[in-house]
């Protein structure tokens, strides 16, 4: 499964699209900043097995896809960029799923690290709660957009796990 190159390319494209989606300058939204506590320490201190890395990356992308597929998200972003971004995420999910099948076989279930999956879910719950509290304001979405860009760039350690042969 030659995922690292494909995934990095798609990840880069998704990041560019996410950057282009911005509507207000972050300079105008400094007061709305929020610490979402991306679980980078947990990821950094862990040597991921290939299947674990895939499942955690899958969860991150799935949660991002869900977040940007809501009605509130549709109202916040320019439609064509949002569609391109969602397509890029969908393709990444497909790539990861194909890789799982290749890595562990169709019959087997990948070794899921529940703690890491849970940490990712809680992180996205905090993001969703923040958006709700801020009533999905333009600046709240800007804060979230910047945060997702950061989390995408933080997932490098997970990609290192994808390069290793188990």
């Amino acid at each position: 499964c030659d995922l690292p190159q494909t995934h990095s390319l798609r990840n880069r494209r998704a990041l560019i699209l996410l950057a282009q989606m911005g509507r207000i300058s972050p300079f105008s939204c400094l007061k709305d900043r929020h610490e979402f506590r991306f679980p980078e320490e947990e990821f950094d201190g862990h040597q991921f097995q290939k299947t674990q890395a895939i499942s955690v990356l899958h969860e991150m992308i799935q949660q991002t896809f869900n977040l940007f597929s809501t009605e509130d998200s549709s109202a916040a972003w320019e439609q064509s960029l949002l569609e391109k971004f969602s397509t890029e995420l969908y393709q990444q999910l497909n790539d990861l799923e194909a890789c799982v099948i290749q890595e562990v076989g169709v019959e087997e279930t990948p070794l899921m690290n529940e703690d890491f999956i849970l940490a990712v879910r809680k992180y996205f719950q905090r993001i969703t709660l923040y958006l709700m509290e801020k009533k999905y304001s333009p600046c709240a979405w800007e804060v979230v957009r910047a945060e997702i860009m950061r989390s995408f760039s933080f997932s490098t350690n997970l990609k290192k796990g994808l390069r290793r042969k188990d």
Partner: antibody, heavy 121, light 107 residues
């Protein structure tokens, strides 16, 4: 590593304009913010405004609104600061400063070497 | 605009001394405060961000504390290379504003 290289010193007449450039290397130019900060001789630091190249539009401090224009050229990874209607009190060292990638533009992580602009008749 | 006031404006100290610089904001800025060091003829250098986080590569003798309106930069044991001017900067809202600076001189 990250580097910001600014254009050379300028001597200008009152009423004229000056355009200072800041060429960046390291990181993805379009996705981080660049601010301009000035320092008059023997004085403190003053934020003039900033830009995130991918947005195109800049934010300015009220004090400089209408007199300063901050732009960015993604093709050359260069940011520019143009100050018009120069007066003697605009004599200062002008710094470009880079904020962290994918982060809110709150702290100045990297600085250019500074450009001295002298306004004198 | 948020005004930042530093004190003292200058101080004299000896190598090995513990030095404390304070910074006060005209309104609450949470923990959105950064500290910079500037040497003559050089660009400022980030030391502390978000009130108390040490910037990578900065010696541990530098520390920051405070939240709301009152903040402190402490140099636990002053070294010869620490003689410089120090600035605080708020990043709570635009315009981003700096304190007037504190010059640390050799006694």
């Amino acid at each position: 590593q990250v580097q910001l290289v600014q254009s050379g010193a300028e001597v200008k007449k009152p009423g004229s304009s000056v355009k200072v450039s800041c060429k960046a290397s390291g990181g993805t130019f379009s996705s981080y913010a660049i601010s301009w900060v000035r320092q008059a001789p023997g004085q403190g630091l003053e934020w003039m405004g900033g830009i995130i190249p991918i947005f195109g539009t800049a934010n300015y401090a009220q004090k400089f609104q209408g007199r300063v224009t901050i732009t960015a050229d993604e093709s050359t990874s260069t940011a520019y600061m143009e100050l018009s209607s120069l007066r003697s009190e605009d004599t200062a060292v002008y710094y470009c400063a880079r904020h962290l990638e994918y982060a809110f533009p709150d702290k100045f992580d990297y600085w250019g070497q500074g450009t001295l602009v002298t306004v004198s008749s | 605009d948020i005004q930042m006031t530093q004190s003292p404006s200058s101080l004299s100290a000896s190598v090995g001394d513990r030095v404390t610089i304070t910074c006060r904001a005209s309104q609450s800025i949470s923990s959105y405060l950064n500290w910079y060091q500037q040497k003559p003829g050089k660009a400022p250098k980030l030391l502390i961000y978000f009130a108390s986080s040490l910037q990578s590569g900065v010696p541990s003798r530098f520390s920051g504390s405070g939240s709301g309106t009152d903040f402190t930069l402490t140099i636990s044991s002053l070294q010869p290379e620490d003689f410089a001017t120090y600035y605080c900067q708020q990043s709570y809202s635009t315009p981003l504003t700096f304190g007037q600076g504190t010059k640390v001189e050799i006694k």
